[in-house]
């Protein structure tokens, strides 16, 4: 084959910052680094046809298909998509390579297909083919991992039946409480499905794919720890596997562990024991209770007993369907402008929820923390003292839950004014909602003390902006006040603000702000 230009085809994926649509080269986006698409000469094709690897992108994604041509001289080009010709403007980069780009903003089904780029250089003509399709994420799933015992081995296998196949990792911690947070140095991660070291304090298995990350903790009763004030509770759905680990440490090997369900010993095949010596020569024993697929009659108090430790129990509750228990009544809060405050929702749920906090159509990440009493709590503190409606939404595989909050920020009114030929209006967003007075400024009343009561129309909370109430007051023009300056004042328990308007002009004049407190 004759000497051909060196062709490089790349994909640039953009993180959308806004909702602009259309093909453009100046776009308000943050770009990821270019990804090589392995452009290669298609064998046995008529003419010189380069083909890039097929590209599969998410719906609404924004991408750039780009070709870099290392060929001498100028190039001209033409894009063809679905038999339509599209404008093509090559430019040259710092390495003097010809650069041709096709920007696809907010990918839709209609923009999927074959993009052909015809390039003419001084030496030769060639075609570059890109195939762009929309990824079918409807088939994607991410399921919470569960445990199985490895055949003929004292080890646990972590399984997550998800699409695409997830990366499975064990998250291990040998400390207590706060120091077992995900990014703590005490936490060790092992990217494998099988775990042999089952003696640790805190053992979790996590699965992650394009949809996110789901984790399951190995439920543990530690006989050396002081029991919780409330009995630990474990929820499972019918058919799910049950795993409870009982752990005990003693100065020597002279002790044993047993499991009972409602005072009856567990059947053989529903438990297995492991033991090891720790660094200080004490003996650690663990005894697993497991049921490969639970039924309703597996509900009850599971008690782990030791010949050398006080026994401890856990309540296992088998449910037909998942649930989210919390009070969904809406809550209103009134706080000062600099007061520290967090919204919080306390709930009990199984399976674990996914949740979001929403304000002004913006979603915020939602963190949840387990409490000792079997409840969980989610707090939201990032409101930046913006008044309005805040929504907590939670869901799991079987249930949904929404709770509304209203946040009011106590502050002195601030007044905005506008005037038309027939009326003057003032607006204020202070809280508590202000009351209004209108005053006329004249020779008789240079300090604007003459109150106007005729033609005033107050509308409390006429505009609800994402839950933020705005109060307004309108003064209808009459001959008695035409040509005069009038002053509208909004006042509440925190102070007063006023705005002065000249009534024969179409706009406010001048914006004299009298901050009378």
């Amino acid at each position: 084959n004759q000497d051909l230009p060196v062709i490089k085809c790349v994909l640039i994926n953009h993180k959308n910052n806004d909702s602009s649509v259309g093909k453009s080269s100046s776009y308000p986006m943050v770009s990821e680094s270019p990804e090589d698409l392995g452009c290669a000469l298609r064998p046995q094709s008529s003419g010189t046809v380069y083909e890039a690897a097929a590209v599969e992108v998410d719906v609404s994604a924004s991408i750039t298909l780009q070709v870099l041509v290392d060929a001498p001289g100028n190039i001209s080009c033409l894009w063809v998509f679905k038999h339509s010709s599209l404008n093509c403007q090559p430019h040259f980069d710092l390495q003097n390579r010809g650069v041709v780009s096709m920007v696809i903003l907010k990918m839709t089904e209609t923009q999927a297909g074959e993009y052909l780029l015809f390039i003419q250089s001084e030496a030769t003509n060639y075609t570059i083919l890109f195939t762009v399709s929309i990824r079918n994420t409807l088939l994607y799933t991410l399921r919470r991992p569960y445990f199985r015992k490895m055949e003929n081995q004292d080890a646990l296998v972590c399984i997550s039946e998800s699409v695409p196949e997830p990366i499975v990792e064990w998250v291990l911690c040998d400390s207590q409480g706060e120091s077992c947070k995900e990014e703590s140095p005490a936490v060790v991660k092992k990217e494998e499905k099988v775990l042999h070291e089952l003696f640790g304090t805190d053992i979790r298995c996590c699965a992650r794919n394009e949809l996110g990350r789901e984790c399951t903790r190995l439920f543990t009763i530690d006989l050396n720890q002081t029991p919780q004030t409330t009995l630990p509770q474990l929820f499972l759905k019918v058919g799910e596997p049950l795993w409870i680990r009982c752990k005990a440490v003693h100065v020597n090997h002279g002790f044993g562990l047993t499991w009972e369900l409602e005072n009856k010993a567990l059947e053989e095949g529903n438990y297995f024991e492991m033991s090891t010596y720790s660094t200080n020569r004490t003996m650690i024993r663990i005894l697993f209770a497991f049921v490969s697929s639970v039924a309703r009659n597996d509900t009850g108090y599971y008690t782990c007993s030791s010949s050398k430790h006080p026994s401890q129990s856990a309540l296992v509750t088998i449910v037909e369907k998942g649930f989210i228990n919390a009070t969904n009544s809406s809550e209103d809060y009134e706080i000062d402008q600099y007061e520290e405050f967090c919204f919080s929702v306390r709930f009990k749920a199984y399976p674990q929820i996914r949740c979001t906090w929403t304000f002004s159509r913006k979603s915020f990440p939602c963190e949840q923390k387990g409490l000792d009493n079997g409840y969980s709590i989610s707090k939201f503190c990032n409101h930046k003292h913006q008044p309005g409606e805040y929504i907590f939404h939670a869901e799991n595989d079987d249930a949904q839950f929404t709770k509304m909050f209203t946040l009011n920020i106590r502050r002195k009114p601030q007044v905005l004014a506008e005037a038309s030929a027939s009326q003057a209006s003032c607006f204020s967003d202070g809280y508590p909602l202000p009351s209004w007075t209108w005053k006329k400024c004249s020779d008789k009343s240079p300090n604007c003390t003459e109150e106007i009561t005729e033609g005033v129309w107050n509308r409390k909370a006429n505009r609800k902006v994402f839950g933020q109430w705005v109060s307004s007051s309108t003064l209808n023009m009459s001959e008695a006040i035409k040509g005069f300056l009038v002053k509208c004042c909004a006042y509440n328990s925190l102070g007063t603000s006023c705005e002065t308007i000249l009534l024969n002009s179409p706009g406010p004049f001048p914006f004299i702000q009298d901050n009378i407190s």
Epitope: E35, L37, A40, P43, A53, V55, E56, I63
Partner: antibody, heavy 124, light 108 residues
């Protein structure tokens, strides 16, 4: 620019499990229909293809080694992991990962970029 | 499973000469899906040719590939000092992917 880099233990004992990681950059399996393969080369011998994984998570394995191999990717981290169970001294080789710019059952099933390789010795 | 046989095992030539390397397959290869790689000592293989005859990016035109069915050839028209290395053919298009045993091209 496209790069691939293999990492893993240099010495493994017989019967143990070997885990190798290939970290790649300059391309991704998240958007483009491509794949990454593991290929090995015993000292002084020929190349032997072991396993392949493509962006749509399709996997294929060498017939002789299928029962001992697993392959997985983490597209977010641009990594691919190969595990080989029950290793034997005959598994001593330089292990390469290489990019395939398309699917293995198409005209794009060759390897256009290779890592520099990592030598794994299996010995007690 | 297709078996790839490369011959000769070793080829001794001088710079400037023409090298012809052969690759035979035990069955017909779909659509001539054959690739050739060069491996210099202590380095990873490098793609030279794909689709039997298409040169990869940056490969000099002294390298050419030909063939069909079960017989494929890599030709180096004028050997340069840096061309002395081991060459492998590979078939693709279906699993398993297989490589030939290699031809060592050495300086005479």
């Amino acid at each position: 620019q496209v790069t691939l880099k293999e990492s893993g233990p240099t010495l493994v004992k017989p019967t143990e499990t070997l885990t190798l990681t290939c970290t790649f950059s300059g391309f991704s399996l998240r958007y483009a229909r491509m794949g990454v393969s593991w290929i090995r080369q015993p000292p002084g011998k020929a190349l032997e293809w072991l396993a392949h994984i493509s962006s749509n998570d399709e996997k294929s394995f060498s017939t002789a080694l299928e029962s001992r191999l697993t392959i997985s990717t983490d597209t977010s981290k641009s990594q691919m992991v190969l595990t080989m169970t029950n290793v034997d001294p005959v598994d001593t080789a330089t292990y390469y990962c290489a990019r395939m710019p398309g699917d293995s059952n198409t005209w794009r099933g060759f390897f256009d970029y290779w890592g520099q390789g990592t030598l794994v010795t299996v010995s007690s | 499973e297709i078996v790839m046989t490369q011959s000769p095992g070793t080829l001794s030539l001088s710079p400037g000469e023409r090298a012809t390397l052969s690759c035979r397959t035990s069955q017909t290869v779909t659509n001539s899906y054959i690739a050739w790689y060069q491996q210099r000592p202590g380095q990873a293989p490098r793609l030279l040719i794909y689709g039997t005859s298409t040169r990869a990016t940056g490969i000099p035109d002294r390298f050419s590939g030909s063939g069909s069915g079960t017989d494929f050839t890599l030709t180096i028209s004028r050997l340069e000092p840096e061309d002395f290395a081991v060459y492998y053919c590979q078939k693709y298009g279906s699993s398993p992917l297989t490589f030939g045993g290699g031809t060592k091209l050495e300086i005479k």
